[in-house]
């Protein structure tokens, strides 16, 4: 399965939209910073078969979509930007789902992939727990926005590596 160039562009558009969503200066939230322990090794495409990498990407985008589809998220962000952002993520999920179906037929995905997906889920659990602990404050959302921008940047790099493998 060849991930279309439009998928990468969609990811870039999602990053740009997320960058525009801020309502307060990140510099007023320096104290709120938190180490979410991003599972960087899961974004290293070198150690994965293609099917594994695609399902990690899918999980990453799915969890991001879920995070920004909550009522608390709707209250935190400007509605039209949030809708555009969610639309970009939804389109990427569709692209990736088609690829997952195609690739899993070609390669049997070993248990290692389940570990990778679990690592991504736990990472998003840590993000959600942080938001709950900080009572979904504007600064907590600002920190989460920065973190998701980081993880989307990692996933963009993983996509580039996948295309180079093709």
């Amino acid at each position: 399965c060849d991930l279309p160039q439009t998928h990468s562009l969609g990811n870039r558009r999602a990053l740009i939209l997320l960058g525009q969503m801020g309502r307060i200066s990140p510099f007023s939230c320096l104290k709120d910073r938190h180490d979410f322990r991003i599972p960087q090794e899961e974004f290293d495409g070198n150690q994965f078969q293609k099917a594994q990498a695609i399902s990690v990407l899918h999980e990453m985008i799915q969890q991001t979509f879920n995070l920004f589809s909550t009522e608390d998220s709707s209250a935190a962000w400007e509605q039209s930007l949030l809708e555009k952002f969610s639309t970009e993520l939804y389109q990427q999920l569709n692209d990736l789902e088609a690829c997952v179906i195609q690739e899993v037929g070609v390669e049997e995905t070993p248990l290692m992939n389940e570990d990778s997906i679990l690592a991504v889920r736990k990472y998003f659990q840590r993000i959600t727990l942080y938001l709950i602990e900080r009572k979904y404050s504007p600064c907590a959302w600002e920190v989460v926005r920065a973190e998701i921008m980081r993880s989307l940047s990692f996933s963009t790099n993983l996509q580039k590596r996948l295309r180079r493998k093709d």
Epitope: G19, G22, S25, P26, F27, D32, R33, D35, M149, S153
Partner: antibody
Framework: QVQLVQSGAEVKKPGSSVKVSCKAS????????ISWVRQAPGQGLEWMGG????????NYAQKFQGRVTITADESTSTAYMELSSLRSEDTAVYYC??????????????WGQGTLVTVSS | DIVMTQSPDSLAVSLGERATINCKSS????????????LAWYQQKPGQPPKLLIY???TRESGVPDRFSGSGSGTDFTLTISSLQAEDVAVYYC?????????FGQGTKVEIK
């Protein structure tokens, strides 16, 4: 290993501008804030401002507002500090320092080697 | 802006003896949401950039010898060098990162008596 490498020493005339660069390697550039700190000869440390590359958002100390511009180029992992309307009292060593936005403490954990800017007619 | 005041301005201590530097902030740098003090200590030797020693008022940066320790909370902080070594001769700065603009103390010069 994270490294911040700054551009070389500059000699400038009063009223002119200087632009100092700071190239980062060995870390995820966009995940951090880059601060600029200056130190006049024999004096203490003074925070001028900073930028969070992932947002492109800069913040400046009131003293330098309107005279300093801090930018970042994610594609080259380089931050820049431009100071305009230079006067003799701007003669100092200018440092860039990484502030771990992407981590869980706020401290300047890696520093550039410093750039001496001399303002003299 | 938060004003940071260090004392003393300079300090002469015999090798192997204890050196104590104080730092006072004009307002609390303790953040109630995570109970952390946003105060750091740096060491600067001549011709070199500052080096981070302590963050969160009392957490040693990795690789920093355990003779360096930080304490205090709210507005009053202390950096202690338990047994001064020749290589500890430097200027020490406290810095708050509770709010922008970040501000530094004026520095304390530590020398050997």
């Amino acid at each position: 290993q994270v490294q911040l490498v700054q551009s070389g020493a500059e000699v400038k005339k009063p009223g002119s501008s200087v632009k100092v660069s700071c190239k980062a390697s060995g870390g995820t550039f966009s995940s951090y804030a880059i601060s600029w700190v200056r130190q006049a000869p024999g004096q203490g440390l003074e925070w001028m401002g900073g930028i969070i590359p992932i947002f492109g958002t800069a913040n400046y100390a009131q003293k330098f507002q309107g005279r300093v511009t801090i930018t970042a180029d994610e594609s080259t992992s380089t931050a820049y500090m431009e100071l305009s309307s230079l006067r003799s009292e701007d003669t100092a060593v200018y440092y860039c320092a990484r502030d771990s936005w992407g981590s869980y403490y706020a401290a300047l954990d890696y520093w550039g080697q410093g750039t001496l800017v001399t303002v003299s007619s | 802006d938060i004003v940071m005041t260090q004392s003393p301005d300079s300090l002469a201590v015999s090798l192997g003896e204890r050196a104590t530097i104080n730092c006072k902030s004009s307002q609390s740098v303790l953040y109630s949401s995570n109970n952390k003090n946003y105060l750091a200590w740096y060491q600067q030797k001549p011709g070199q950039p500052p080096k981070l020693l302590i963050y969160w008022a009392s957490t040693r940066e990795s690789g920093v010898p355990d003779r360096f320790s930080g304490s205090g909370s709210g507005t009053d902080f202390t950096l202690t060098i338990s047994s001064l070594q020749a290589e500890d001769v430097a200027v020490y700065y406290c810095q708050q990162s509770f709010d922008v603009p970040y501000t530094f103390g004026q520095g304390t010069k530590v020398e050997i008596k």
